[in-house]
């Protein structure tokens, strides 16, 4: 009886269970009553990443420098090229097809997580006791200066954008 289902890494064609081509190879000819499946390695700059019966390999992704992209991991016959963004830029999507400049955190906000090639800067508001007076993609919120440890007193309160201003303590008059 001809099979109606085949084992793993096989496919059914013309009532025959044929072996799939291994990753990195494409199908040249289906198996027959007389022959095994014929497969050929993918060419330079091509890949197939699964057991397959594809007659054409896929082209490796091109990391276009005009879009701010560079190669993070070179493709093989079994894997696609992985692109990432140039320094100071990050991918606009998971597929990393183009890049945008990292966002800076405005005064009053600090960097919670520095941007990577695939994720943007994450900013957070500076909580009480902390400030940021610059627009930066790297600077965290800084703690207000502790006047007490310098034997000084707060002359001007800090905000989320400014540090406290310390001054000398008033001398007690007799």
């Amino acid at each position: 009886e001809p099979p109606t289902a085949c084992r793993e890494k096989q496919y059914l064609i013309n009532s025959q269970c044929c072996s799939l081509c291994q990753p990195g190879q494409k199908l040249v000819s289906d198996c027959t009553e007389f022959t095994e499946t014929e497969c050929l390695p993918c060419g330079e700059s091509e890949f197939l990443d699964t057991w397959n019966r594809e007659t054409h390999c896929h082209q490796h992704k091109y990391c276009d420098p005009n879009l701010g992209l560079r190669v993070q991991q070179k493709g093989t016959s079994e894997t696609d090229t992985i692109c990432t963004c140039e320094e100071g830029w990050h991918c606009t999507s998971e597929a990393c097809e183009s890049c945008v400049l990292h966002r800076s955190c405005s005064p009053g906000f600090g960097v919670k997580q520095i941007a990577t090639g695939v994720s943007d800067t994450i900013c957070e508001p500076c909580p009480v006791g902390f400030f940021s007076n610059v627009s930066s993609a790297f600077e965290k919120c800084h703690p207000w200066t502790s006047c007490e440890t310098k034997d000084l007193v707060v002359q001007q309160a800090g905000t989320n954008k400014t540090d406290v201003v310390c001054g000398p303590q008033d001398r007690l008059r007799a």
Epitope: N14, S15, Q16, S19, V28, S29, D30, F34, T35, T55
Partner: antibody, heavy 115, light 112 residues
């Protein structure tokens, strides 16, 4: 239905070349190899080789590598085998055949090499 | 090359008899994929070969069940359980496990 059509006979002089044809119909030509087999009168069969019409890739019996050239014309769904430097040893019936979802043979071309 | 040896060369039978043809190969025909590419076919006078059995024991569509194939490795047999007049001709075995593909010399099935 699947058919492989071959001319009935060819008469050629020693030293010359001949191009035998095999016209396929009734199926997608590029999906299956075409193979060629030689049968001399009253003798057994010899496998010459095959060609993949999809990409022109061939596999050969080493014995026939310098004797036979296999080609295809996809536009007319025809396979060809050219035999060169013919001698009386090349006089035989030449069959084209295809397998996959059944086996199909042409009727054979009788090649006579004679002066 | 793999040498295929068929016996007997000639097999005289009476109609209705059982016939048995042997085919031996000079090396194992078991392919690395687990299949054994040993095949049988019949050639009648003035005709193209007609395939009967593929991969040792699988009958092609339309082949009567009186034809059966068996064997493994290097030793194979074709049996015809009750010979009919239309079965007469030359039987060949062939192997397609190893390149070049090779054929047996043939066994002529004829009336006693």
């Amino acid at each position: 239905q699947v058919q492989l059509q071959q001319p009935g006979a060819e008469l050629v002089k020693p030293g010359a070349s001949v191009k035998l044809s095999c016209k396929a119909s009734g199926y997608t030509f590029i999906s299956y190899y075409i193979y060629w087999v030689k049968q001399r009168p009253g003798q057994g069969l010899e496998w010459i080789g095959g060609i993949n019409p999809r990409n022109g890739g061939t596999n050969f019996n080493e014995k026939f590598k310098s004797k036979a050239t296999l080609t295809v014309d996809k536009s007319s769904s025809t396979a060809y085998m050219q035999l060169s430097s013919l001698t009386s040893e090349d006089s035989a019936v030449y069959y084209c055949t295809r397998h996959g979802n059944g086996v199909y043979w042409g009727q054979g071309t009788t090649l006579t090499v004679s002066s | 090359d793999v040498v295929m040896t068929q016996t007997p060369l000639s097999l005289p039978v009476s109609l209705g008899d059982q016939a048995s043809i042997s085919c031996r190969s000079s090396q194992s025909l078991l392919h690395s994929n687990g299949n054994t590419y040993l095949h049988w076919y019949l050639q009648k006078p003035g005709q193209s070969p007609n395939h009967l059995i593929y991969q040792v024991s699988n009958r092609f569509s339309g082949v009567p069940d009186r034809f059966s194939g068996s064997g493994s490795g290097t030793d194979f047999t074709l049996k015809i359980s009750r010979v009919e007049a239309e079965d007469l001709g030359v039987y060949f075995c062939s192997q397609t496990t190893h390149v070049p593909w090779t054929f047996g010399g043939g066994t002529k099935l004829e009336i006693k």
